[in-house]
């Protein structure tokens, strides 16, 4: 099991990258002046206490920014949020911190990220550009839930 976060670059199948704008992650077309965030991911060390068939449970952070992706309810709807948190603190916790965990599932070159706290909800971007990342239950419709990962360094 890795004990250091792995830096990755993420883009969707429409070649849009993740950019931080006013503490919100948005997906925009890759252009010269766009500087995508580098995502850090690390596997949960308590993998044996989580469901085994949904993917690899991981924490997702923004490299060097002390911000991590998490899921929380807003009303009755789960939402995707960025929270100030050290990814290694999450990694070292005595239990899986489910609100910050995602099942990372790979099929060929495509990756999906399903919320551990809210099973059936996936990180997604709207088919239109320049939209914030969201959580959705609607797979392959108006939202894109498939992403490509490129390992860095």
């Amino acid at each position: 099991k890795s004990e250091m976060p792995q830096p990755v670059s993420i883009q969707d199948i429409n070649h849009r990258v993740w950019v931080l704008q006013d503490q919100i992650l948005i997906a925009v077309p890759r252009k010269d002046r766009v500087s995508p965030v580098t995502i850090s991911l690390i596997s949960c060390r308590h993998v044996e206490t989580l469901e085994k068939d949904r993917g690899n449970p991981i924490y997702l952070g923004l490299n060097g920014l002390n911000l991590c992706l998490m899921c929380a309810k807003a009303g009755d709807q789960p939402t995707l949020q960025l929270k100030e948190k050290d990814i290694m603190d999450l990694y070292n916790q005595p239990e899986p911190v489910k609100s910050f965990l995602f099942y990372h599932s790979q099929s060929g070159r495509n990756s999906t990220f399903e919320s551990v706290a809210f099973p059936g909800w996936f990180i997604a971007v709207s088919s239109e550009g320049g939209c914030p990342l969201i959580l959705t239950q609607e797979l392959g419709k108006a939202n894109t839930t498939d992403f490509g990962l490129t390992m860095l360094f």
Partner: antibody, heavy 121, light 109 residues
């Protein structure tokens, strides 16, 4: 109001088994972890283990492996501790406690009132 | 298995500041031990006071604070009150299990 209500005192014979109950109200046990702790007379606390009621996965202190079984029923919001092959060493008060994440850390925040188990012939 | 040691008893006066400590037999207590502090009052009434070394859950009075002092975890009660008379247990995380201390009986006279 968050509460953990435990079953009443038990007097059982050596070699027998017993199942202790912890019923939660004011929250859904699927949203947290339930820990079990043992307190023997005039001694400190011992961590027995935990269950994640959302998926029934358990972890134990190795010294309670084989002695304790943890289960949960999410439909009744109840967690259970079963103790087998009882001896006088198992005479103690047993507590369930919620191990809950508050955004910065986990806490042993709410506790049951304890179940007194006496093992005697 | 690690042994966690606490003062067996301490006495303080109302309004005074008192510090309880928690030592590990394996060496210095660090933030990776995620020290928790729990209060026990008569009739088996337990309440969690501190988690993750220095975090207080909602509803716990601000006079309770957690920290690391030297190589130990510490619980400080700033301005002790008579209702703080209780037994205080610390618990330390050791990668795959929790170990509790023997408890400190605090008397507020």
């Amino acid at each position: 109001e968050v509460q953990l209500q435990q079953s009443g005192a038990e007097l059982v014979k050596p070699g027998a088994s017993v199942k202790l109950t912890c019923t939660a109200s004011g929250f859904n046990i699927k949203d947290t972890y339930i820990y079990w702790v043992k307190q023997r007379p005039a001694q400190g606390l011992e961590w027995i283990g935990r269950i994640d009621p959302a998926n029934a996965y358990t972890k134990f202190d190795p010294k309670f492996q084989g002695k304790a079984t943890l289960t949960a029923d999410t439909s009744s919001n109840t967690a259970y501790l079963q103790l087998s092959s009882l001896t006088s060493e198992d005479t103690a008060v047993y507590y369930c406690t919620r191990f809950h994440w508050y955004g910065s850390s986990f806490f042993f925040d709410y506790w049951g009132q304890g179940t007194t188990l006496t093992v005697s012939s | 298995q690690a042994v966690v040691t606490q003062e067996s008893a301490l006495t303080t006066s109302p309004g005074e500041t008192v510090t309880l400590t928690c030592r590990s037999s394996t060496g210095a207590v660090t933030t990776s031990n995620y020290a928790n502090w729990v209060q026990e009052k008569p009739d088996h009434l337990f309440t969690g006071l501190i988690g993750g070394t220095d975090n207080r859950p909602p509803g716990v009075p601000a006079r309770f604070s957690g920290s690391l002092i030297g190589d130990k975890a510490a619980l400080t009660i700033t301005g002790a009150q008579t209702e703080d008379e209780a037994i205080y247990f610390c618990a330390l995380w050791y990668s795959n299990l929790w170990v509790f201390g023997g408890g400190t009986k605090l008397t507020v006279l």
